[in-house]
Every structure is written in structure tokens, then in C-alpha cells.
Interface confidence: low
């Protein structure tokens, strides 16, 4: 919920990419006596759904009527910021991120309903909502006090590589299986039948009448 | 109450360097920062920076040529002023803010503390 009142052209911002042991919670957590610029809100706690998508409402009291705004979003764990995605938009126009990136939003008025995608697990931490009132002069900004997303990596329903192994495990059973059962057959085929000649195919006299010719074959060895 | 004591002002060359250095007393809150006022002139912000050290804020007439920094350990903030100009030529202030949140260039209200001052004389 930082506010300031540095005219957009006599003022720089300035995120340092250095973390110190004093995190930017002593910065956060104050409560605003003072603040008259710029007043930001969003929900204490998110849980991303299971699918690893987390929606919330960052809300900021305009000191003015801003017509361009900007709305970053930042990433607090472990002492380390980092900035999540930006987007700036027109008053009345729809918020409009990156393609690359993870996150998507919708304006309305003084709220801008911010959806982050694609968290896992190690994303869990606390996500700042800072918003800028880049024109007309003066320059504001307001930040939030963060909204501590949870992400929980959704249970395998089972695991499906576990469900590839036992697939592939009992599909090379049922084959070697089959093919045991083959062989076998075959064997026991092969033993029963009487040992063949090797050499001519005598021409057996005709068992049937004169008038149904039937030819007999001839087995000529190749010596 | 938080006591600001600043040092390191004096006299220069145009072109020349000065560090000046603010050691609050006991711990200030979220933002620690500089203001000047020139003879004549109303105060203006120079820099901010936010007690984490991860954000610094600067005005447009001395970005590029001045830092501010902080050193944790010693509880102090610094501002390093290169490239001096006869413009910069004012008292110096070390403000905190260990509540307020509204600090504006033109609105030093914002800022609970504030120090003696420390000259800074920039010849050309």
C-alpha cells in the first residue's frame, strides 16, 4: 500500500536486482497514516486451483483520473523479488499482457481482476500488486500488501507413468505368453505327425473313377 | 524519537564528488530518502529508497549522476553525488517515513523525520 506522488517526469523508478536480509515486508506492512496519493487492495490469501490458476482483485484508490495506468505484478519469496508480468493499459480499455505471458487480467473502473497461470508448487509465495497512474501528471504509485498464493501440485490420479509400466509389464506377459503358447503347440504338432520322406513323390494310382481326373504333384529333388 | 544526524557536505568543484551519510538513531521504517532545499527555493525530493534496499526512487534532475544506497549493518543511507553542478548547490535533509506512505517531491509531509541538514556549496 505504498504510495507516491513524484511527478511521472521528475522521477525514475529504480527495481533493484540486490536482495538484503531486510526483506520488503518492513517496506509493506505499515499501516498508511499519511497516504493521501494512492491506496492499493488485494485479498490476503489465494489458492490456485488444481490446475494451477490463480485469480485476484487488486483495487486502487485514483487520487485523480488517471488515463493510463500501469499494473505489475511482483513475486516476494525467500527475500527476492521478481516481477511477474506488466501490462499498462487506457481507463476503459482492456488490460493487455504480453503473449508470452503467464498472466491475463480485466479492468474495471479501479479494480483489475488479475488471473496468473501455469503455477506449480515452487510458486507458492507472496504476489505484490503494484499500479502505476503514468498520465496525466503526477506520477503515482501505489503497491499492495501482497497476496500469498498457495499452489498445491495435484495428486496423481494414479501417476500415469506407474500406469505406463504396468501397461507395458503385462502387455510383454500376454506376448511372451502367447508366444510360449505357440511354440508349445507347434512342438507337440510336429511330434505327433509321422517322419516325412525326403526325396520323390511317387504317383499313387487314382483312388477315384477314370472320369474325374485329378492330377498328382511331383517332387523333383535337385541334387 | 528517531534523531537523523547527516555528514559528508562541504564544498566543491563543479564536476566533483561528495558522499553525504545519514545514521538514524534507532530503526526508521519503510523509507529512507533526501530532500534539498536552495536558497529561495522550495524543498524538493532528490531520492528515496524503501528499507529493503530493493526499490530506489530519483528525481529527474539528478538521475544518472547521484545514488542512493544503504548499508543494513550500520543502520545508514548514503548519497553519492558525482557530476555536481552549481544547481545542486543546497541544504541537504535525511527524512524517514516509518508510516507515512505518501512522499512526494513537491509534499515533504509525508515524512515524519527529518534531520538538521548538511550544506552542500557547488562552485563552478
Known amino acids: 500500500m505504498a504510495c507516491l506522488g513524484f511527478q511521472r517526469h521528475k522521477a525514475q523508478l529504480n527495481l533493484a536486482t540486490r536482495t538484503w536480509p531486510c526483506t520488503l515486508l518492513f517496506f509493506l506492512l505499515f499501516i498508511p497514516v499519511f497516504c493521501k496519493a494512492m491506496h492499493v487492495a488485494q485479498p490476503a490469501v489465494v489458492l490456485a486451483s488444481s490446475r494451477g490458476i490463480a485469480s485476484f482483485v487488486c483495487e486502487y484508490a485514483s487520487p485523480g483520473k488517471a488515463t493510463e495506468v500501469r499494473v505489475t505484478v511482483l513475486r516476494q519469496a525467500d527475500s527476492q523479488v521478481t516481477e511477474v508480468c506488466a501490462a499498462t493499459y487506457m481507463m476503459g480499455n482492456e488490460l493487455t499482457f504480453l503473449d508470452d505471458s503467464i498472466c491475463t487480467g480485466t479492468s474495471s473502473g479501479n479494480q483489475v481482476n488479475l488471473t496468473i497461470q501455469g503455477l506449480r508448487a515452487m510458486d507458492t509465495g507472496l504476489y505484490i500488486c503494484k499500479v502505476e497512474l503514468m498520465y496525466p501528471p503526477p506520477y503515482y504509485l501505489g503497491i499492495g500488501n501482497g497476496t500469498q498464493i498457495y499452489v498445491i501440485d495435484p495428486e496423481p490420479c494414479p501417476d500415469s507413468d506407474f500406469l505406463l509400466w504396468i501397461l507395458a509389464a503385462v502387455s510383454s506377459g500376454l506376448f511372451f505368453y502367447s508366444f510360449l503358447l505357440t511354440a508349445v503347440s507347434l512342438s507337440k504338432m510336429l511330434k505327433k505327425r509321422s517322419p516325412l520322406t525326403t526325396g520323390v513323390y511317387v504317383k499313387m494310382p487314382p483312388t477315384e473313377p477314370e472320369c474325374e481326373k485329378q492330377f498328382q504333384p511331383y517332387f523333383i529333388p535337385i541334387n | 524519537q528517531v534523531q537523523l544526524q547527516e555528514s559528508g557536505g562541504g564544498s566543491v568543484q563543479a564536476g566533483g564528488s561528495l558522499r553525504l551519510s545519514c545514521a538514524p538513531s534507532?530503526?526508521?521504517?519503510?523509507?529512507m530518502g533526501w530532500f534539498r532545499q536552495a536558497p529561495g527555493k522550495e524543498r524538493e525530493g532528490v531520492a528515496v529508497?524503501?528499507?529493503?534496499?530493493?526499490?530506489?526512487y530519483y528525481a529527474d534532475s539528478v538521475k544518472g549522476r547521484f545514488t542512493i544506497s544503504q548499508d543494513t549493518a550500520k543502520n545508514t543511507i548514503y548519497l553519492q553525488m558525482n557530476s555536481m553542478k552549481p544547481e545542486d548547490t543546497a541544504m541537504y535533509y535525511c527524512?524517514?517515513?516509518?508510516?507515512?506512505?505518501?512522499?512526494?517531491?513537491?509534499?515533504?509531509?509525508?515524512?515524519?523525520?527529518w534531520g538538521q541538514g548538511t550544506q552542500v556549496t557547488v562552485s563552478s
Open positions: 527524512v524517514a517515513a516509518p508510516e507515512a506512505r505518501a512522499w512526494s517531491s513537491r509534499d515533504p509531509t509525508g515524512y515524519n523525520y
Open positions: 534507532r530503526y526508521s521504517g519503510a523509507l
Open positions: 529508497i524503501s528499507r529493503s534496499g530493493l526499490t530506489t
